[in-house]
Interface confidence: medium
């Protein structure tokens, strides 16, 4: 029987089931002392553990939630810059939104990430898992700043609807404010969107790369009094 | 062309009431506020405050609160200065301007002597 | 309030000199739409004033090139290259950054 490091919880993990395969892999290496597995097995099991935990991955459907992901963003894009063409052709004051310019940095990472998300869906590499994950967890911190940012936004914009026609406007002003504060709720809307898909395409990947076996694994052979002789043996990544 | 144009000279006693018009032209009226500004002789500009033209929402300056009103007949693109109780030292030009004070009215011209 | 204040008070120049007046406010008049609500205005002799410059530096239609306003911030100048008689009167800057707008004390320019 053995002892393990897990890196995930119990019901997260694949280790139990490649773990319990590994009792009956356990074969003399010629020179290497007893108990000790030969380390081409342990490749293959963690060439195994990869495969349950790339499905792991892969349940959370990277490839369609990253199409969306880029759908919303391109939304977010053109919503952004058509504000900024209604705003800066005002003689008058713009959200908050606009100003900030968030619509347009926040798309480009947002494409990326779900670019890398299909990627990583196609191919699912631990590079590309890995780098899905963490511009995944970026783009769920600057969607939580973007609801932020639209939030004040619009509460500080719907301030103007009352002094809009101060600084005057060719169009009927509070039209173009109406339009402005619907825009801006419609990128609020998105954020809130990009916010879940980003988080969750970070959980799954989280799963299948916070889960891999990087850590120390200690094997305890079944005849207790040669535990002291059982070296620690590290799991290198493939 | 755009053109703001405001009521004759007045000639007041104190203590009365005087309205002043403002009758824009030539632009969306609805699109730009409207300011009062006044002006005694020999002296410099002074804000009074301005009216959103679209919601007739006022806004007033704070040495122009209470005895002064803006008021809006949007249907005839003109916008009114009400001054209750009149006193010696409103004696002044009363000018009508878009906030943006991009266009001005010609001034009426108010005299309140005993 | 946004306090503005004029200088000179009085500018006496000859016809063909240039002209200078400063104006100064009292806090930033830069808004966070990133627009700077200064304007110029000129009010001749018996006239209603007649706007000249605004967002600083921009020449309302109809104003010779002669006119130029600059600045930023709290401190802003309009000149005048190349005075003529009709640009006598007194000269008022204007701010719209806040929605109680004020005006500076006027300048007056007077033909030597």
């Known amino acids: 029987h053995q002892t393990y490091r897990r890196h995930c919880r119990p019901e997260e993990s694949t280790f139990s089931a490649a773990m319990t395969t590994m009792q009956g892999m356990e074969q003399a290496t010629p020179g290497a002392g007893p108990g000790v597995p030969q380390l081409g097995n342990m490749a293959v099991v963690h060439s195994h553990l990869w495969k349950g935990l790339q499905e792991k991955f892969l349940k959370g459907e990277p490839k369609v939630l990253g199409v969306v992901q880029i759908l919303i963003a391109l939304m977010s894009l053109s919503m952004g810059i058509t504000m900024m063409c209604v705003a800066f052709s005002a003689y008058g004051h713009y959200p908050i939104s606009v100003y900030i310019g968030y619509t347009i940095w926040g798309s480009v990472m947002f494409i990326i990430s779900g670019s890398l998300s299909i990627a990583a869906g196609i191919r699912t590499t631990k590079g590309l898992v890995r780098g899905s994950l963490g511009m995944n967890i970026t783009s769920s911190v600057l969607a939580v700043s973007a609801i932020l940012i639209n939030t004040i936004s619009l509460t500080i914009y719907s301030f103007y609807h009352r002094y809009c026609n101060y600084y005057g406007n060719p169009n009927n002003c509070h039209g173009t404010v109406s339009i402005l504060m619907g825009m801006d709720g419609m990128v609020l809307l998105l954020s809130v969107l990009e916010f879940c898909i980003a988080v969750s395409l970070s959980a799954f990947g989280c799963k299948a790369i916070c889960c891999t076996p990087g850590g120390v694994v200690l094997i305890i052979p079944s005849n207790s009094h040669m535990a002291e002789a059982a070296p620690l043996t590290p799991l290198n990544e493939v | 062309q755009i053109q703001l144009v405001q009521s004759g000279p007045e000639l007041k006693k104190p203590g009365e009431t005087v309205k002043i018009s403002c009758k824009a032209s030539g632009y969306i009226f609805t699109s730009y506020g409207l300011s009062w500004v006044k002006q005694t002789p020999g002296k410099g500009l002074k804000w009074m405050g301005w009216i959103n033209t679209y919601s007739g929402v006022p806004t007033y300056a704070n040495d122009f609160k209470g005895r002064f009103a803006f008021s809006l007949e949007t249907s005839a693109s003109t916008t009114y200065l009400r001054i209750n109780n009149l006193k010696n030292d409103d004696t002044a030009t009363y000018f009508c301007a878009r906030s943006l004070v991009d266009y001005w009215g010609q001034g009426t011209p108010l005299t309140v002597s005993s | 309030d946004v306090v503005m204040t004029q200088t000179p008070f009085t500018l006496s120049v000859t016809i063909g000199q240039s002209a200078s007046i400063s104006c100064k406010s009292s806090q930033s008049l830069l808004y966070s739409d990133g627009k700077t609500y200064l304007s110029w205005l000129l009010q001749r002799p018996g006239q209603s004033p007649k706007r000249l410059i605004y967002?600083?530096?921009k020449l309302d239609s109809g104003v010779p090139d002669r006119f130029t306003g600059s600045g930023s911030g709290t401190d802003f100048t309009l000149k005048i290259s190349r005075v003529e008689a009709e640009d006598l009167g007194v000269y008022y800057c204007w701010q719209g950054i806040d929605f109680h707008q004020t005006f500076g004390g006027g300048t007056k320019l007077e033909i030597k």
């Open positions: 967002l600083v530096s």
